[in-house]
């Protein structure tokens, strides 16, 4: 792959970077005086970017990579929580390895928690990818959920839907999928806790408790779905909304709702 062009030097660390760019020239080699075909940036190893949540003990090193290519050579820059990330924003700074499309932060501390976004761009396009960093106390610790999951979904009537919840936990977590429901027209019980229905939980024939799949959805299944994860240290939960739409010119189909795992109970959320 081509080596990326170095952006402004303010992103470079003070320490040297031996593996920075070992190409003799970053210019395109032209043999026939024709310009190479432009290519917008693209990920060269997307499978190495699938792990978005990184829960790391204090003092360790974090390396985030966004291996990319494009023509002309794309530039690489990093944001923290959506804002420009400069070395003086953290004690010890950071290193950007342009040859390996990576950022390295040594000796992480709790204030390093946040979302780190790589932006790879050339004049023909821009791509970005966000990693979530949590600096944790070593195990045991509370469960940690990847930000943005589960994600809101809008689907057509009769579709299948998949919600995902990415969990980092030691000790072993207990995962529950809940749906807020109404009982006798009320969403809140007499004890002021919301009514929920348990759709799935780890330990009850759940091959993959981090994923909730709903088949042939009905309008009645619209609503808020909650991924609740707990261990003996604590708990965490995140929710998403399902909106089920139906074609405007189609009559409402007569379908019976059949919950996956019917158990009405009060649950604090």
């Amino acid at each position: 792959r081509p080596s990326p062009t170095l952006p402004e030097q303010d992103a470079l660390p003070s320490s040297e970077d031996d593996d920075d760019d070992d190409d003799s020239s970053s210019e395109e080699k032209e043999t026939d005086n024709t310009k190479p075909n432009p290519v917008a940036p693209y990920w060269t190893s997307p499978e190495k970017m699938e792990k978005k949540l990184h829960a790391v003990p204090a003092a360790k090193t974090v390396k985030f990579k966004c291996p990319s290519s494009g023509t002309p050579n794309p530039t690489l820059r990093w944001l923290k929580n959506g804002k420009e990330f400069k070395p003086d924003h953290r004690i010890g700074g950071y290193k950007v390895r342009y040859a390996t499309w990576s950022i390295i932060m040594d000796s992480v501390v709790p204030s390093d928690k946040g979302n780190y976004t790589c932006i790879v761009e050339n004049e023909y396009g821009s791509i970005n990818h966000t990693y979530q960093l949590d600096v944790v106390e070593r195990s045991p610790h509370r469960p940690i959920l990847q930000a943005g999951l589960p994600a809101n979904k809008t689907v057509a009537l009769g579709s299948n839907v998949e919600f995902m919840c990415k969990v980092y936990s030691d000790p072993q977590p207990h995962i529950q999928w809940l749906k807020h429901i109404e009982v006798n027209g009320s969403k809140i019980g007499p004890d002021n806790l919301p009514y929920v229905q348990i759709l799935k939980h780890s330990g009850i024939n759940s091959s993959d408790a981090e994923v909730l799949t709903l088949f042939n959805v009905t309008e009645a299944q619209s609503g808020e779905y909650v991924c609740k994860v707990s261990n003996y240290i604590g708990e965490a939960n995140q929710s998403a909304w399902l909106t089920v739409t139906r074609p405007a010119l189609e009559e409402r189909p007569a379908v019976m709702t059949s919950p996956l795992y019917l158990e009405h109970h009060h649950h604090h959320h």
Partner: antibody, heavy 116, light 108 residues
Amino acid sequence: QVQLQESGPGLVKPSGTLSLTCAVSGGSISSNNWWSWVRQPPGKGLEWIGEIYHSGSTSYNPSLKSRVTISVDKSKNQFSLKLSSVTAADTAVYYCARATDWFDLWGQGTLVTVSS
Amino acid sequence: SYVLTQPPSVSVAPGQTARITCGGNNIGSESVHWYQQKPGQAPVLVVYDDSDRPSGIPERFSGSNSGNTATLTISRVEAGDEADYYCQVWDSTSDHRVFGGGTKLTVL
């Protein structure tokens, strides 16, 4: 400058408990570091045993976890290793070390022999 | 658990370049550190974070890390470089530190 010094018995009987202490001088054990133990059997390679943070949080090598306890004494600026149910296979030079992601400072090492 | 594989020995003539490899599954995603150990002495860090050198380590020592292999390169090898060399990572998946088996560098 920070220095590390291991101390403890050089001879331990089989089935007994190996106990070593590492004194940290010239710096605070409450810094943002992990305080580790690494061993090296005669003529063999390095083996990470485990480590502790000043908060008391620990991590151990899975192969030794059932026998290892690492503790920290902030008032004395030192940390300790206990390895129970030792056998001749535990004979090694034991190093204490300071670490972040890597080990940047090592003690000189102490040879512990397990023998009756 | 994560495994790091090093060649048991590497031989090189003085003035030549020695390359010591450290193999591991997708090791390029980890930060690799290298230590030199001479007989009867504690290990000394020679490269950290794949390619950085601590102060006092000669420029002849360099490192790289990509894919499934990290490499320690010693250029213009001297007799005093004869030692055992170990690679090490903190495996972020298991939250454990791992050493390679070590490579004995012999200067011919």
